[in-house]
């Protein structure tokens, strides 16, 4: 359906609202290090433009493409080549190269500040004072941190926000109402940043059929008594959406997910029953509800697969005739029948499934040749469920820090040349597996654990393609998305790497150690274990966990002392020298 | 196994209409191939019309534009509705299916078949 005037088009769809909180998004995802009031104008001028071609759909330049509106608007900014280098090079570009380029630019880990919080009346007062322009600011500084943050989602968080100072602000403990909003809000702000990166990495760096089939195999465990023909289409229209969000066309992606949410409400009857409390909601609310919502029941008595995947006469015929399609339906009705398996899995059985029959249709005796095709699925079921219970038991018996660090060791070992920094976030996200998944029946685990696996490891994979420095990395990061975790588990020891030079500096520590938060005091521990790691390859758990308990307990005493900074510059050497003693 | 049961078949005056359904029971088979042939006495055995999982549909250039073929697959049924009917329509109609993504045309395709239901096209 064109319209003459596609800004026009989005603005009456989105309402003003939207469309402005949208094109700030955007603006703050491309240029991540304009400072928030020049995006702010830059949005008003957009939005007094789009409010033209409302008016007037024949007006000038209505009829020009967003990317070229967005893109023009962007290369006006006069500090592009001074901010951001070569991403200026973008400008001298057509659309669509432009918007390539643009995309190509953004970066996943922008040298930005953290951010501060700031007390809850200097807070609160804010809020107060300027409502409007205390929440653009909410979405500028995460949008500009996370490039790739789901941004219809993102409009969903901002108005959380709004509702949590709006409540706690008039509360007569303000902090106490307000700080677990902002700390649940921080923390699944962050989850949902990670699960998008990871749509946006499947569809940039495998394809949409790669998409599809995750989609597929997703929406066939939330959505069992759905057919597979009403399955297709949610996952076309999925596709669609997050395509459009990955690329930077973040008011078609917001349109484009309301009218699916519309959809899955006006056939609720057809997809699931676990809908209904969803659709009550306003759109944000809606949207967000529904795209989280519980699997629904599995049909009773669903027949077995093997009749119609093994012993049927046509399992070539169907193969050859229409490939995807015939592998859409198998993941289709193995992911009903399977909420217990992680996505990951569940198309690893697929692909399974797919060479076999590959092999198989091309043979003398094709039946023959497929007929213990499930069989071969024994192991691949097994291993995901060997892990979960092994590094289950092992959080239950170390606790979240020790596990953690577990975990750090391992990483460690395996890809040394990692960054310090990226090796401890990597392996601090690694570790919050148990706490998230491991309590769950078993029934939850292996969906919750791989699954969240997949998004962490994605985060690697994205880190170390900007700063690629271990070939064993990029080759678990590009070679299959859903092997990637078996990839890295599979990894041992590098032996290839000389380990790092011992430096006296990277181990000396201050009185600044014991104000640090408890969080912040983990992160130091944590990158001095890693620094040991990349020293002592080959230290054992046993020499390591003894410099961790002495580095525990010299810090302890030094932020007892008196004067901790002289207790820090005489019992730092003493640490130092007994680690190296003890690892040699 | 898939059990088919046709109905709906009877006497209609050439120009007329009737529907034809065809239920099935025995596993679910809302991604089965479904179709329609019918036999007129001394003939082979004909295509009418097939439809597929995502409900395209495809027919005997005899029929096309006369009748239409649809499935309910919450029901578990599919449907023939036939329009302008003919004298030469007069056949037993046989309702078929079979696991496959792109419904055949061909009666050697087909793994289940119904008993068939009666149309007579009096002129």
């Known amino acids: 359906d064109t319209h003459k005037s596609e800004v026009a088009h989005r603005f009456k769809d989105l309402g003003e609202e939207h469309f402005k909180g949208l094109v700030l998004v955007a603006f703050s995802q491309y240029l991540q290090q304009c400072p928030f009031e020049e995006h702010v104008k830059l949005v008003n001028e957009v939005t007094e433009f789009a409010k033209t071609c409302v008016a007037d759909e024949s007006a000038e330049n209505c009829d020009k493409s967003l990317h070229t509106l967005f893109g023009d608007k962007l290369c006006t900014v006069a500090t592009l080549r001074e901010t951001y280098g070569e991403m200026a090079d973008c400008c001298a570009k057509q659309e669509p190269e432009r918007n390539e380029c643009f995309l190509q630019h953004k970066d996943d880990n922008p040298n930005l500040p953290p951010l501060v919080r700031p007390e809850v009346d200097v807070m609160c007062t804010a809020f107060h004072d300027n409502e409007a322009t205390f929440l653009k600011k909410y979405l500028y500084e995460v949008a500009r941190r996370h490039p790739y943050f789901y941004a219809p989602e993102l409009l969903f968080f901002a108005a959380r926000y709004k509702a949590a100072f709006a409540e706690c602000c008039q509360a007569a403990d303000k902090a106490a109402c307000l700080l677990p909003k902002l700390d649940e809000l921080r923390d699944e702000g962050k989850a949902s940043s990670a699960k998008q990166r990871l749509k946006c990495a499947s569809l940039q760096k495998f394809g949409d059929r790669a998409f599809k089939a995750w989609a597929v195999a997703r929406l066939s465990q939330k959505f069992p008594k759905a057919e597979f023909a009403e399955v297709s289409k949610l996952v076309t229209d999925l596709t669609k959406v997050h395509t459009e969000c990955c690329h930077g066309d973040l008011l078609e992606c917001a349109d484009d997910r309301a009218d699916l949410a519309k959809y899955m409400c006006e056939n609720q009857d057809s997809i699931s029953s676990k809908l209904k409390e969803c659709c009550d909601k306003p759109l944000l609310e809606k949207s967000h509800c529904l795209a989280e919502v519980e699997n629904d029941e599995m049909p009773a008595d669903l027949p077995s697969l093997a009749a119609d995947y093994v012993e049927s006469k046509d399992v070539c015929k169907n193969y050859a005739e229409a490939k995807d399609v015939f592998l859409g339906m198998f993941l289709y009705e193995y992911a009903r029948r399977h909420p217990d398996y992680s996505v990951m899995l569940l198309l690893r059985l697929a692909k399974a499934y797919e060479a076999t029959l590959e092999k198989c249709c091309a043979a003398a005796d094709p039946h023959e040749c497929y007929a213990k095709v499930f069989d071969e699925f024994q192991p691949l079921v097994e291993e995901p469920q060997n892990l979960v219970k092994q590094n289950c038991e092992l959080f239950e018996q170390l606790g979240e820090y020790k596990f953690q660090n577990a975990l750090l060791v391992r990483y460690t070992k395996k890809v040394p040349q990692v960054s310090t920094p990226t090796l401890v976030e990597v392996s601090r996200n690694l570790g919050k597996v148990g706490a998230k998944c491991c309590k769950l029946p078993e029934a939850k685990r292996m969906p919750c654990a791989e699954d969240y696996l997949s998004v962490v490891l994605n985060r690697l994979c994205v880190l170390h393609e900007k700063t690629p420095v271990s070939e064993k990395v990029t080759k678990c990061c590009t070679e299959s998305l859903v092997n990637r975790r078996p990839c890295f588990s599979a990894l041992e020891l590098d032996e290839a790497y000389v380990p790092k030079a011992f430096n006296a500096e990277t181990f000396t520590f201050h009185a600044d150690m014991c104000t640090l938060s408890e969080k912040e005091k983990q992160v130091k521990k944590q990158t001095a274990l890693v620094e040991l790691v990349k020293h002592k390859p080959k230290a054992t758990k046993e020499q390591l966990k003894g410099v961790m308990d002495n580095f525990a307990a010299f810090v302890e005493k030094c932020c007892k002392a008196d004067d901790k900074e002289a207790c820090f510059a005489e019992e730092g050497p003493k640490f130092v020298a007994a680690s190296q003693a003890a690892l040699a | 196994q898939v059990q088919l049961i046709e109905s709906g078949g009877g006497l209609v005056q050439a120009g007329g209409s009737l529907g034809l359904s065809c239920a099935a029971s025995?596993?679910?088979?809302?991604?089965?191939?479904a179709a329609w042939f019918r036999q007129a006495p001394g003939k082979e055995r004909e295509f009418v019309a097939a439809?597929?999982?995502?409900?395209?549909?495809t027919y005997a250039d005899s029929v096309k534009g006369r009748f239409t073929i649809s499935r309910d697959n919450a029901k578990s049924t599919v449907a023939l509705q036939m329009n302008s009917l003919k004298p030469e329509d007069t056949a037993v109609y046989y309702c078929?299916?079979?696991?496959?993504?792109?419904?055949?045309?061909?009666?050697?395709?087909?793994?289940?078949w119904g008993q068939g239901t009666q149309v007579t096209v009096s002129s």
């Open positions: 078929a299916a079979v696991f496959r993504v792109v419904a055949p045309k061909t009666q050697y395709d087909y793994d289940y």
């Open positions: 025995g596993r679910p088979v809302s991604n089965y191939a």
């Open positions: 439809i597929n999982w995502n409900k395209t549909a």
